[in-house]
């Protein structure tokens, strides 16, 4: 810890300015008033302090606000934010989206640090839910943010927030997360017309049930193979050859290239070879002609 030493004559800081970069650490400690620093935090960012000098400034703020910094200070932390520990941040009460944006800007272009994760957690908990503006902000800085949340956390996302989600924000989501997000997206986009609806819902379809896929197959949507390959296997299996043909439209040709991969592989195994042959794509592995198809799920339900 920096030793308490008297400020040399004439060195007492009257404002936060560039002259302070020439102060030694002990001089900063002795000559900069914490209250002055707190009121002029917005100037710190414009001054090229060394990391050691920033450590001193942080120490002064910690002494002034042992229970946690006020938002007026937090909003102007700038690069000093990088000096904060998750423990420091847990003491904060951040309610302004502008404050959140300002701090995320400091960390822009880097992976989400433990500090940022703690800040976001504090902010979202303070708001009570992940509203549209917050989601918009977070996904702009961290496209993978949504997929870093647990299904339980995602359940607090209101459907209205789904409008802020871009396709790339869902790239790393797993099926359990999409299971939670899909019904919200369906609700959010329910008043859109067919083609516009499909464009919006497409990224969320990894959580769609069979009934919805069947409904989409009647709407001339031309789902691409990349989207089809991300569908839940259990949702694809009950689809008929005709339904898959309608769902994919001109992309049905792509099934051949994917016939060894899930869910196409598993779907093929459930279809009659006769029906697969009607596609003219040479898909192999269907149920041979004359074989009886037992619906085991129905059998279980009856027994």
């Amino acid at each position: 810890e920096v030793e308490k030493t008297a400020c040399p004559s004439g060195k007492k800081a009257r404002e936060i300015d560039e002259s302070l970069i020439f102060y030694k650490k002990w001089e900063l400690e002795a000559c900069v008033d914490a209250a002055l620093l707190a009121t002029q935090m917005d100037r710190v960012n414009a001054i090229p302090f060394t990391y050691e000098q920033l450590d001193v400034l942080k120490h002064k703020l910690d002494e002034l606000y042992p229970q946690g910094y006020p938002e007026s200070v937090i909003q102007h932390l700038g690069y000093l934010f990088l000096k904060m520990s998750p423990e420091d941040i847990r003491k904060w009460n951040v309610t302004s989206l502008e404050t959140l944006k300002a701090l995320l800007e400091v960390n822009k272009g880097h992976e989400m640090s433990p500090q940022v994760a703690t800040l976001i957690d504090r902010f979202v908990k303070g708001r009570g839910q992940l509203d549209k503006d917050t989601l918009d902000t977070l996904t702009a800085f961290y496209p993978g943010y949504l997929c870093s949340l647990s299904p339980e956390e995602l359940s607090s996302v209101p459907p209205s927030s789904i409008w802020a989600v871009r396709p790339q924000d869902l790239d790393t989501c797993d099926p359990r997360q999409l299971d939670v997000l899909y019904p919200k997206a369906r609700l959010a986009f329910q008043n859109m017309n067919g083609s516009e609806y499909f464009v919006k819902i497409q990224s969320f379809l990894g959580g769609a049930p069979t009934e919805d896929l069947k409904a989409l197959s009647q709407q001339n949507v031309s789902m691409d193979l990349a989207t089809f390959m991300k569908l839940r296997t259990d949702a694809v299996l009950p689809l008929t050859v005709a339904e898959v043909q309608k769902l994919l439209g001109p992309h049905v040709e792509g099934l051949k290239a994917e016939e060894r991969h899930r869910p196409v592989r598993d779907w093929i195994l459930r279809q009659r070879q006769d029906d697969l042959d009607t596609l003219g794509l040479g898909l192999q592995g269907g149920i041979p002609n004359g074989y009886l198809v037992l619906d085991l799920s129905m059998q279980e339900a009856l027994s």
């Epitope: 001109p250 051949k256 003219g280 040479g282």
Partner: antibody, heavy 116, light 107 residues
Framework: EVQLVESGGGLVQPGGSLRLSCAAT????????MHWVRQGPGKGLVWVSR????????VYADSVKGRFTISRDNAKNTLYLQMNSLRAEDTAVYYC?????????WGQGTLVTVSS | DIQMTQSPSSLSASVGDRVTITCRAS??????LTWYQRKPEKAPKSLIY???SLQSGVPSRFSGSGSGTDFTLTISSLQPEDFATYYC?????????FGQGAKLEIK
């Protein structure tokens, strides 16, 4: 390796007949739709006809309807095009091709010349 | 029948160039369009299907775009082996129809 080899082309007089064959190897022939496509001298590609995998459904271009017949023998892995009432404008290299609406594999073609 | 019109019918370019060929359908064909590459004495090769989906094994410098009536084939950086004739073809309805072809030559 998928291979399609056309044969049966040659010189024929207007009004005459010719039967083209396309021998398929390297894939399950009976599962695929097949097509005939032609290209006249100095011209572009023109689709002629299509047959489904089991031979129960055929489609023709208007220019050959009633004169040409597409057929297949899945036991012999062979596609056929029976061409009757041939005209000078039927002169072209004829290709057989595998696929649905998209022809992913083609043969090297066989030349049909209709001339007196 | 659906008419397919390609432009330009021929073009000259150099290795490394970005090249664009367009194809117009006489009526709405959605995304039911494919592009072929044809080299002399060789069978046509399918490059793109469903207007924008790359056939497996085709280099990523080839891309397709468009829907409805206007479509584009783009080669982002021409390679020596790309000099050929390119055809578009609709498979929305029978009879299947091709564009007249666009011959890409070395400048």
């Amino acid at each position: 390796e998928v291979q399609l080899v056309e044969s049966g082309g040659g010189l024929v007089q207007p009004g005459g007949s010719l039967r083209l064959s396309c021998a398929a190897t390297g894939f399950t022939f009976s599962s695929y739709w097949m097509h005939w496509v032609r290209q006249g001298p100095g011209k572009g590609l023109v689709w002629v006809s299509r047959i489904n995998s089991d031979g129960t459904s055929t489609v023709y271009a208007d220019s050959v309807k009633g004169r040409f017949t597409i057929s297949r023998d899945n036991a012999k892995n062979t596609l056929y095009l029976q061409m009757n009432s041939l005209r000078a404008e039927d002169t072209a290299v004829y290709y057989c091709a595998r696929g649905r609406g998209i022809m992913t594999y083609w043969g090297q073609g066989t030349l049909v010349t209709v001339s007196s | 029948d659906i008419q397919m019109t390609q432009s330009p019918s021929s073009l000259s370019a150099s290795v490394g160039d970005r090249v664009t060929i367009t194809c117009r359908a006489s009526q709405d064909i959605g995304s039911w369009l494919t592009w072929y590459q044809r080299k002399p004495e060789k069978a046509p090769k399918s490059l793109i299907y469903a207007a924008s989906s790359l056939q497996s094994g085709v280099p990523s410098r080839f891309s397709g775009s468009g829907s409805g009536t206007d479509f584009t084939l783009t080669i982002s950086s021409l390679q020596p082996e790309d000099f050929a004739t390119y055809y578009c073809q609709q498979y929305k309805s029978y009879p299947l129809t091709f564009g007249q072809g666009a011959k890409l030559e070395i400048k």
